[in-house]
């Protein structure tokens, strides 16, 4: 049960809803965007003000952390289970400090299981945040400060901070350090989406959201 199902059941107001794991009674709270692009979006990540520390452990990224009404990470395990039940799209919405907004939309998104380190799988990029995917293709395993699965001899998560699908280390990290305005340039460990803003630019706000492809 995701935000798309919640929407179809008649709840069309943005807010926090209780979702359930597929084939389970286990529950999780998530923010549902019921307005953008037709609604039904399950928010799986949000950065907006630096109020939450994203330099977390593997377990924390697995189960989720933060506050669904503000900055949070929904949880790799829930997202993995959800996206392996049916086909999902992923939309990433970005804001810079100059008032610009952009997005990347992937027409097929899923995460592998924990045994496969929640590897990200993406197909079919469109949008305004770069013609090239800032999440390295083919997808990489997820890495955290205590779970180094990247392709670098270094430890990307420790150097760039945050858990992410690091390559070596690659052109994005939406879970990097949050830098406020006027401190957001020439930061090598900030919130980065390279093929929109280049390197060293740390973004103001990001949202990652998913919805069934047949919504």
């Amino acid at each position: 049960r995701d935000c798309a199902e919640v929407f179809k059941s008649g709840h069309t107001t943005n807010g926090i809803y209780t979702l359930t794991f597929p084939n389970s009674t286990e529950e999780i709270k998530a923010y549902c965007d019921m307005e953008a692009g037709g609604g039904g979006w399950t928010i799986i990540q949000r950065r907006e003000d630096g109020s939450v520390d994203f330099q977390r452990t593997w377990k924390e990224y697995k189960v989720g952390f933060g506050n669904p009404s503000g900055e949070y990470w929904l949880g790799n395990e829930f997202v993995s289970q959800l996206t392996n039940q049916q086909r999902y799209v992923l939309k990433i919405h970005l804001k810079d400090w100059e008032g610009n907004e952009a997005y990347s939309l992937y027409e097929h998104f899923y995460l592998s299981s924990e045994e496969l380190n929640y590897r990200i799988h993406l197909k079919g990029l469109t949008g305004t945040a770069g013609k090239i995917s800032s999440i390295s293709q083919p997808g990489n395993d997820f890495s955290t400060k205590d779970g180094d699965n990247d392709k670098c001899m270094c430890k990307c998560s420790q150097m760039l901070t945050g858990g992410w699908w690091f390559d070596a280390c690659g052109p994005s990290n939406l879970n990097g350090m949050y830098y406020p305005q006027r401190q957001n340039t020439n930061k090598f460990n900030g919130i980065k989406w390279y093929y929109w803003k280049g390197s060293g630019y740390s973004l103001k706000a990001t949202t990652m959201m998913i919805r069934p492809a047949d919504f």
């Epitope: 670098c152 270094c154 420790q158 070596a168 280390c169 690659g170 090598f188 280049g198 390197s199 060293g200």
Partner: antibody
Amino acid sequence: QVQLVQSGVEVKKPGASVKVSCKTSGYTFSNNGFSWVRQAPGQGLEWLGWISGYNGNTNYAQKFQGRVTMTTDTSTSTAYMELRTLRSDDTAVYYCARDQDYSNFHWLDPWGQGTLVTVAS
Amino acid sequence: DIQMTQSPSSVSASVGDRVIITCRASQGLSSWLAWYQQKPGTAPKLLIHSASSLQTGVPSRFSGSGSGTEFALTINSLQPEDFGTYYCQQANSFPLTFGGGTRVEIK
């Protein structure tokens, strides 16, 4: 393999300008940035500045601000460094070097062979 | 700007010796540090990045260690071809800065 080939020796008079080129091959130009580093005779390494191969963003050392301009030509995969109002203490070997800009990694590999710029009246 | 202080400024050692070069940063770098080797008349060559990661093709007798403000480059069993000048470089923030260099001579 990745190669950076710089332009040849330059001899300039004080007050003149010099423009050094750095032609690259063997990799995706837009994924990387370039630092320019100089080395005066018998001295250590001094960083002049950096340019992104992706969007042309630059960052110059304060010492050279207003006197240096770094540019790229993506059609020819070439980076350029122009230094104006030359003085005798600008005599040095000037190097271009590639970094992994898209990963925010600014260690430098490989380097060009260097361009000797001599400033003398 | 971050200042990088290298020591010693020069060292003379015999083939087979262990040589340790240190580099101190004026502020914390996490692991954003690289080491280079330069031989006379040639461009510097990257040896180590991320403080301790050996660049591809560099002999395993070279190793890097440290984090924060204190770093070291160790050459185990010095070879005749290891002569030259070694530089550390911080990649934590612009402006990039180098240490003053350590000249390694073979006795």
